[in-house]
């Protein structure tokens, strides 16, 4: 599923991201947009052998299990695939992992480099929420 | 267990396409990738791509784009890859397997024979 | 694309014997590295997965080491049934590539 710019900042509010270890929902919907344009089913591999999965694009050497990633932490408990449904609530609950895990949202590369101390409230601008 | 079929040998003419199809059972199929490996007498395996099931994501070896094409069914927990353009370079025995890094799972493979 | 060279192409042995099969690749792939057994008109076999775990059901006459660059499947005491084509695989990167093969032969 490709969600709508309002259409996933609707629903990142009801599964409670808004504000969530400090960090509106601005952020989390400009981090949706760079890492995968919103769209669910978005996956990429690095070099590293692990493969990103999702909206959020969760990664498989720590967060999720693919089934292939050399030493694979799991973190979060989930196979990969489940990061790909069209409900986003198991990207969701696994990113609040990754965002309490020290680094805050500098662990999405794409937040850092395009959405770090930029108008991030641009992106829930208009929305009914 | 896990087990992968796939579909029995094939002869097609040249120019023609053929679709080969892997069914998988005894694991949750939309959780891993299914990879394709093609495999010639003196050519050794060659990875063709893969595609996992639970979202249609595909990846192609560059060699075999616009030869390949994969899908799966995920009601029927079925792969497949279709080839078009059929050449004699083609003839091959085509393996599907699962994708775990290593391949443990491996289906019995798809002979195909290109002739005129 | 990671180049696997294998050595060598054949190698003729009696029962009995012990053998060193190499896989070498054309950039440092740490340890992912599988190697796989074939025979005739069947699929490839897991032997070894990540250079050196042995797969379960696997004799252990069979293993494996190495890391980087270079890689090696010994077999401790032929068998007969050790016959046929062994192949060696990388996982670091895509696109994955396989090595040409060392046929093992009854000498």
């Known amino acids: 599923k490709v969600f709508g710019r309002c259409e996933l900042a609707a629903a990142m509010k009801r599964h409670g991201l808004d504000n969530y270890r400090g960090y509106s929902l601005g952020n989390w919907v400009c981090a949706a947009k760079f890492e995968s344009n919103f769209n669910t089913q978005a996956t990429n591999r690095n070099t590293d052998g692990s493969t990103d999965y999702g909206i959020l694009q969760i990664n498989s050497r720590w967060w999720c299990n693919d089934g292939r990633t050399p030493g694979s932490r799991n973190l979060c408990n989930i196979p990969c695939s489940a990061l790909l449904s069209s409900d986003i609530t198991a990207s969701v609950n696994c990113a609040k992992k990754i965002v309490s895990d020290g680094n805050g949202m500098n662990a999405w590369v794409a937040w850092r480099n395009r959405c770090k101390g930029t108008d991030v409230q641009a992106w829930i601008r208009g929305c009914r929420l | 267990q896990v087990q992968l079929q796939e579909s029995g040998a094939e002869v097609m003419k040249p120019g023609a396409s053929v679709k080969i199809s892997c069914k998988a059972t005894g694991y949750t199929f939309t959780t891993y990738w299914i990879e394709w490996v093609k495999q010639r007498p003196g050519h050794g395996l060659e990875w063709i791509g893969e595609?996992?099931?639970?979202?249609?994501?595909?990846y192609y070896n560059e060699k075999f784009k616009g030869k390949a094409t994969f899908t799966a069914d995920t009601s029927s927990n079925t792969a497949y890859m279709q080839l078009s353009s059929l050449t004699s370079e083609d003839s091959a025995v085509y393996y599907c397997?699962?994708?775990?890094?290593?391949?443990?799972?491996w289906g019995q493979g798809t002979t195909l024979t290109v002739s005129s | 694309d990671i180049e696997l060279t294998q050595s060598p192409a054949t190698l003729s042995v009696t029962p009995g014997d012990s053998v060193s099969l190499s896989c070498r690749a054309s950039q440092s792939i740490s340890n992912n590295l599988h190697w796989y057994q074939q025979k005739s008109h069947e699929s490839p076999r897991l032997l070894i997965k990540?250079?050196?775990q042995r797969d379960s059901g696997i004799p252990s006459r069979f293993s494996g080491s190495g890391s980087g660059t270079d890689f090696t499947l010994s077999i401790n005491s032929v068998e007969t049934e050790d016959f046929g084509m062994y192949f060696c695989?990388?996982?670091?990167?895509?696109?994955?590539?396989f090595g040409g093969g060392t046929k093992l032969e009854i000498k």
């Open positions: 397997a699962r994708g775990d890094g290593f391949y443990y799972y």
């Open positions: 695989q990388q996982s670091n990167s895509w696109p994955r590539t």
């Open positions: 990540y250079a050196s």
């Open positions: 595609i996992l099931p639970g979202s249609g994501s595909t």
